[in-house]
């Protein structure tokens, strides 16, 4: 038969011979010949490959370094790599989480509309009318002024997007 | 057809080293398949795996025989090598070279014998 | 690590099935599906009869099958022949690329 010119899914051209691709977890060690098939051997510890494959080396699984604020979020298998977040109160730098920075803080007259995760930045929001925020924070929301109503009371001095309205005794009118 | 050829000296003296060098033919070292082993069999007895070696040059090695034992690639030559050091009467064998980890194809062994 | 034990030896008559086993532990012959045998004649190079447990280069007699249960490979020649009488040997993945050799089986065909 003429030799093949492509191979099946899950498999590689060598030779003019059609041979199986090693499964994920592992690593070629030999194309496959005209008395056995492809020889693959497991991937060891701290290693890995994903996919179905002809490499003849696993990668090594990234290493979480915590002088980088790093710590494992999900510990890597034959099959699968480490995944790394970052220590509480910092968040990576990359898609890729190769280093953390600590979450920003919102300012005076800001909120915070999303609270960091150890992928992503604190999002801050400005405060807008009726609402204050009057502490840098990482995880303060904009408040509401205080309703000088609801207490039988009365506005003396506006807020701001940076206070509170001040709220004092009502003027009793004499007859 | 894949061949394998080890040769080298028959007679070594205790304390010396020994060594041992395998030649492929009819493939390359580098194609086909990536790692080459060494295995031997003392006079009588059973099989003992010695190492192997990726053919860019990464080694691994029986961890009995690991502290004397080193195992090179020359892939220009289509050859490689077998070093034991500080050998004794324990290590007289017949010396294998074999494709893989699976050992489909070997060489026909070499009688290696330890004595002054 | 240490070698894999095999009995000594094993016999039968023409015609009849023998099966050799090969125990190891959970770091080899149970914790990976890498287990081959070989057959060696007096004086000759070995030669792989059985890889990843109980697949057969081609070329190899099907009178020759392999099969594993926990830590324990056998491997079972049926319908013995002459041509069958041989050291055999079992070998094993061990992980981070090292492996393990059983002892070896002397099989005589009565």
């Known amino acids: 038969p003429e030799p093949p010119t492509a191979c099946r899914e899950k498999q590689y051209l060598i030779n003019s011979q059609c041979c199986s691709l090693c499964q994920p977890g592992q690593k070629l060690v030999s194309d496959c010949t005209e008395f056995t098939e492809t020889e693959c051997l497991p991937c060891g510890e701290s290693e890995f490959l994903d996919t179905w494959n002809r490499e003849t080396h696993c990668h090594q699984h990234k290493y979480c370094d915590p002088n980088l604020g790093l710590r494992v979020q999900q510990k890597g298998t034959s099959e699968t790599d480490t995944i790394c977040t970052c220590e509480e109160g910092w968040h990576c730098t990359s898609e890729a989480c190769e280093s953390c920075v600590l979450h920003r803080s919102c300012s005076p007259g800001f909120g915070v509309k999303q609270i960091a995760t150890g992928v992503s930045d604190t999002i801050c929001e400005p405060c807008p009318v009726g609402f204050f925020s009057n502490v840098s924070s990482a995880f303060e929301k904009c408040h509401p002024w205080t309703s000088c109503e609801t207490k039988d009371l009365v506005v003396q001095q506006a807020g701001t997007n940076k206070t509170d309205v001040v709220c004092g005794p009502q003027d009793r009118l004499r007859a | 057809q894949l061949q394998l050829q080890e040769s080298g000296p028959g007679l070594v003296k205790p304390s010396e080293t020994l060594s041992l060098t395998c030649t492929v033919s009819g493939g390359s070292i580098s194609s086909s398949s990536y790692y080459w082993g060494w295995i031997r069999q003392p006079p009588g007895k059973g099989l003992e795996w010695i190492g192997n070696i990726y053919y860019r040059g990464d080694t691994y090695y029986s961890p009995s025989l690991k502290s004397r034992v080193t195992i090179s690639v020359d892939t220009s030559k289509n050859q490689f090598s077998l070093k034991l050091s500080s050998v004794t009467a324990a290590d007289t064998a017949v010396y294998y070279c074999?494709?893989?980890?699976?050992?489909?194809?070997w060489g026909q062994g070499t009688l290696v014998t330890v004595s002054s | 690590q240490s070698a894999l034990t095999q009995p000594p030896s094993a016999s039968g008559s023409p015609g009849q099935s023998v099966t050799i086993s090969c125990t190891g532990t959970s770091s080899d012959v149970g914790g990976y599906n890498y287990v081959s045998w070989y057959q060696q004649h007096p004086g000759k190079a070995p030669k792989l009869m059985i890889y990843?447990?109980?697949k057969r280069p081609s070329g190899v007699p099907d009178r020759f099958s392999g099969s594993k249960s926990g830590n324990t490979a056998s491997l079972t020649v049926s319908g013995l022949q002459a041509e069958d009488e041989a050291d055999y040997y079992c070998s094993s993945y061990a992980g981070s690329n090292n492996l393990v050799f059983g002892g070896g089986t002397k099989l005589t065909v009565l």
């Open positions: 074999a494709k893989g980890f699976r050992f489909d194809y």
């Open positions: 990843e447990v109980s």
